[in-house]
């Protein structure tokens, strides 16, 4: 999918409101510097093209994303903001309905997770350097 | 807003133990923050002593280590610091403080401090 | 453990004129997601310390904006650009990569 179109403003909104804080809830106090960020993206489509990969395709070592709340808003998010992307994402649903949810939070998920957190910080902060916004924590 | 109030006893004897707690109001001890304690000995600069996190996990620095406990308390929206075999090295002005996490996991900000208080070891 | 040391220690300033405090870590504060994990808190006469900046140089919520941080690494400097009376205190940067967290020795900022 090319997230050349979406509305980045908007995806930007909903994650400052809910998805940070499903992500922070499910990283459960573990901080985001204990884990080397090894993902990263130039640009607001590239971001969003490396946030959707880590969110929605299993890896060996961590399984399960696909199903946290986080990742439903995500896809909430993406399918809301972005033209067409729902219609992409039909047959991956239908796919992901198939796996069982693993109920453990393993180490490698907390990593995924976090570098998760980096690629959205890369994405508002090329966002707000597009706006000439200066950003508060 | 939120706020957070350290109470215990203002004076302790060289070889006790140091009892404070901190109580927090206009936030859940439950929310993904950590809280800390920091401590100033008198004209003297900050000290991190060490976190909790609502689910019991802790850092604390090694320095202090073998005589530090913290503890929470989540019912009573407290936290509480625990300081062993004092000596008047130990006499500062003690904060509790949190550590809310960022829009992006990040800790490390202590963004709402206690007012301190004193605590004299002497005997 | 991670060493913060400050210069200078002691800082008069004339109300109106810049300000600027230094800090250096004993290694890299600067974390693989490109940002530096190092605050600057003021602790004003009688009060607790209060947060400045965090991540280098991004201002807390509600800090006016004569006071900015820079640095990357190990060498980060706060400066006020126009001192107001109501700046004085001392002054701390922290490191924020790893506990144990430490704070450097503290810059007393007074009015001249």
């Known amino acids: 999918y090319d997230f050349t179109n979406c509305d980045f403003q908007k995806i930007e909104a909903d994650y400052l409101r809910t998805i940070s804080k499903d992500l922070i809830t499910y990283m459960s106090g573990t901080k985001s510097t204990d884990f080397n960020n090894t993902v990263s993206c130039s640009n607001r489509p590239h971001c969003l093209t490396e946030i959707q990969s880590l969110t929605f395709n299993p890896t060996p070592r961590c399984a399960s994303l696909a199903k946290e709340m986080f990742a439903r808003k995500t896809k909430a998010t993406l399918a809301l903001w972005c033209p067409g992307y729902s219609e992409t994402q039909i047959n991956a649903t239908q796919a992901m309905k198939k796996r069982r949810k693993r109920k453990v939070t393993t180490n490698k998920c907390l990593e995924q997770v976090s570098q998760l957190l980096g690629l959205w910080r890369r994405f508002i902060r090329t966002l707000l350097k597009k706006q000439h916004h200066h950003h508060h924590h | 807003q939120v706020q957070l109030q350290e109470s215990g006893p203002g004076l302790v004897k060289p070889s006790g133990t140091l009892s404070l707690t901190c109580a927090v109001s206009g936030d859940s001890i439950s929310n993904y923050n950590w809280w800390s304690w920091v401590r100033q000995p008198p004209g003297k600069g900050l000290e991190w002593i060490g976190e909790i996190y609502h689910s019991g996990r802790t850092n604390y620095n090694p320095s202090l280590k073998s005589r530090v406990t913290l503890s929470v308390d989540t019912s009573k929206n407290q936290f509480s610091l625990r300081l062993s075999s004092v000596t008047a090295a130990d006499t500062a002005v003690y904060y509790c403080?949190?550590?809310?996490?960022?829009?992006?996991?990040?800790?490390?900000?202590?963004?709402?401090w206690g007012q301190g208080t004193l605590v004299i070891v002497s005997s | 453990d991670i060493v913060m040391t400050q210069s200078p220690l002691s800082l008069p300033v004339t109300p109106g004129e810049p300000a600027s405090i230094s800090c250096r870590s004993s290694?890299?504060?600067?974390?693989?997601?490109?940002?530096?994990?190092l605050d600057w808190y003021l602790q004003k006469p009688g009060q607790s310390p209060q947060l400045l900046i965090c991540l280098g140089s991004d201002r807390a919520s509600g800090v006016p904006d004569r006071f900015s941080g820079s640095g990357s690494g190990t060498d980060f400097t706060l400066k006020i650009s126009r001192v107001e009376a109501e700046d004085v205190g001392v002054y701390y940067c922290?490191?924020?990569?790893?506990?144990?967290?430490?704070f450097g020795q503290g810059t007393k900022l007074e009015i001249k």
């Open positions: 290694q890299s504060l600067l974390h693989s997601n490109g940002y530096n994990y």
């Open positions: 922290m490191q924020a990569l790893q506990t144990p967290y430490t």
């Open positions: 403080a949190r550590d809310a996490p960022s829009d992006y996991g990040d800790y490390g900000f202590f963004d709402h």
